[in-house]
């Protein structure tokens, strides 16, 4: 048994941590493997993941972490039964993807602008609060080609629109995503997406 | 907001036992190890004790064998229990979280040994 | 166990000047590890600097530290009123644990 791709990790730079791998042929990941990691810390101890298996020579675990500091180490150990199949190290804090952001609500009834709101989702104490910037997603289900990105590089996780950049009379759908320019990470995962009908009264137009 | 909030601190003969609590709030206190720092009149802050998440503790050499830091992540509370006592553990003992610095302190409680 | 020193242990200046604060290490200290504190009469030390240079959060831009291996320094570029304190350098490290530097007291002049 041998580790044909080693273990890749990625950290929500909160709790979890996750780390892929590709076996050389099929395997029972619960059953024939078991990752340890250890934060490098004083105080620490080691943990043992189960991994799950990812498509037939995949592997996949879930890292269950203490709360990430930017100068965190860990290592990793991924042994089959007694044998050391490999040996590597992991900073999450230069491998993250944010956490996706949450409860992306629409509101509709502010005078002819679309008010899209959601849940920044880490929590106050945590160094990627004050960090983060979204990409709001938004697109029509009747009209494949009407989709639009919008970037909001301030902080506040809320972005207005004009009902009027949009089709009125047909339904919209919006998602949001996060990254962090401080630690260079990915993007997380898109938001589940939200629906509303878009409707506003057309300018009475002058001649 | 994050929050450590002690209680504990008083005054006790040369000797005796004082047992030190800090409440954290704000945070997942399960996920985050944390420390007591002491502060004598007059002197310098010194590291004390620390626990991480799983219960491993460290203590400082001038306290060894006489102190002990618990945790109880149900109730979000961090203990010192501090046994016989000496002139030089009056200091003012400050809760802290963190990990190799320390973010976030306590009030503070102030502990006295004196005859 | 590894010794910090802090010098000087006394700095008198007026607001408006720049403070330097040494901090020397009996070993070398991984700049990770190294942090800086502020403390003020019957109040909490609080968090400047970590890593060795990345300010904490809120604390302003005046405040900046620099160094590695033994030799660390802490800088306030321009004193206000509310930086005249006692500053604590510390470390951590995997063996040894966490110790402080005795302290610079940074009063007005």
């Known amino acids: 048994m041998k580790v044909l791709q080693e273990p890749t990790c990625v950290s929500d730079y909160m709790s979890i941590s996750t780390c892929e791998w590709k076996m050389n042929g099929p395997t029972n990941c619960s059953t024939e493997l078991r990752l340890l990691y250890q934060l490098v810390f004083l105080l620490s101890e080691a943990h043992t993941c189960i991994p799950e298996n990812n498509g037939g020579a995949g592997c996949v675990c879930h890292l269950l972490m203490d709360d990430v500091v930017s100068a965190d180490n860990y290592t990793l150990d991924l042994w089959a039964g007694q044998q050391l199949l490999w040996k590597g190290s992991f900073k999450p804090s230069e491998h993250v993807k944010p956490r996706a952001p949450g409860n992306l609500t629409v509101h509709t009834n502010v005078s002819d602008t679309l008010l899209l709101t959601w849940s920044n989702p880490y929590p106050p104490d945590n160094y990627l609060y004050n960090h983060l910037t979204y990409a709001v997603n938004i697109w029509s289900e009747n009209d494949p080609a009407d989709f639009r990105i919008y970037n909001v590089t301030y902080l506040e996780p809320s972005l207005r629109i004009a009902a009027s950049t949009l089709k009125s009379g047909i339904s919209y759908r919006a998602r949001v995503r996060a990254w962090a320019q401080c630690y260079n990470t990915t993007w997380s995962e898109w938001s589940p997406s939200t629906k509303w009908h878009n409707s506003y009264r057309e300018p009475f137009e002058q001649h | 907001e994050v929050q450590l909030v002690q209680s504990g601190g008083g005054l006790v003969h040369p000797g005796g036992s004082l047992r030190l609590s800090c409440a954290g709030s704000?945070?997942?206190?399960?996920?985050?190890?944390m420390f007591w720092v002491r502060q004598a009149p007059g002197k310098g802050l010194e590291w004390v004790s620390g626990?991480?998440?799983?219960?491993?503790?460290s203590y400082a050499d001038s306290v060894k064998g006489r102190f002990t830091i618990s945790r109880d992540n149900a109730k979000n509370s961090l203990y010192l229990q501090m046994n016989s006592l000496r002139a030089e553990d009056m200091a003012v003992y400050y809760c802290?979280?963190?990990?190799?610095?320390?973010?976030?302190w306590g009030q503070g409680t102030l502990v006295t040994v004196s005859s | 166990e590894i010794v910090l020193t802090q010098s000087p242990g006394t700095l008198s200046l007026s607001p408006g000047e720049r403070a330097t604060l040494s901090c020397r290490a009996s070993?070398?200290?991984?700049?990770?590890?190294l942090a800086w504190y502020q403390q003020k009469p019957g109040q909490a030390p609080r968090l400047l600097i970590y890593?060795?240079?990345s300010r904490a959060t809120g604390i302003p831009d005046r405040f900046s530290g620099s160094g590695s291996g033994t030799d660390f320094t802490l800088t306030i570029s321009r004193l206000e009123p509310e930086d005249f304190a006692v500053y604590y350098c510390?470390?951590?490290?995997?063996?040894?644990?966490?110790?402080f530097g005795q302290g610079t007291k940074v009063e007005i002049k």
């Open positions: 890593g060795a240079s």
């Open positions: 802290a979280r963190g990990r190799y610095y320390f973010p976030w």
């Open positions: 510390q470390q951590y490290d995997h063996s040894a644990g966490w110790t």
């Open positions: 626990i991480g998440t799983g219960g491993a503790t």
């Open positions: 704000g945070f997942t206190f399960s996920r985050n190890a």
């Open positions: 070993q070398s200290v991984s700049s990770s590890y």
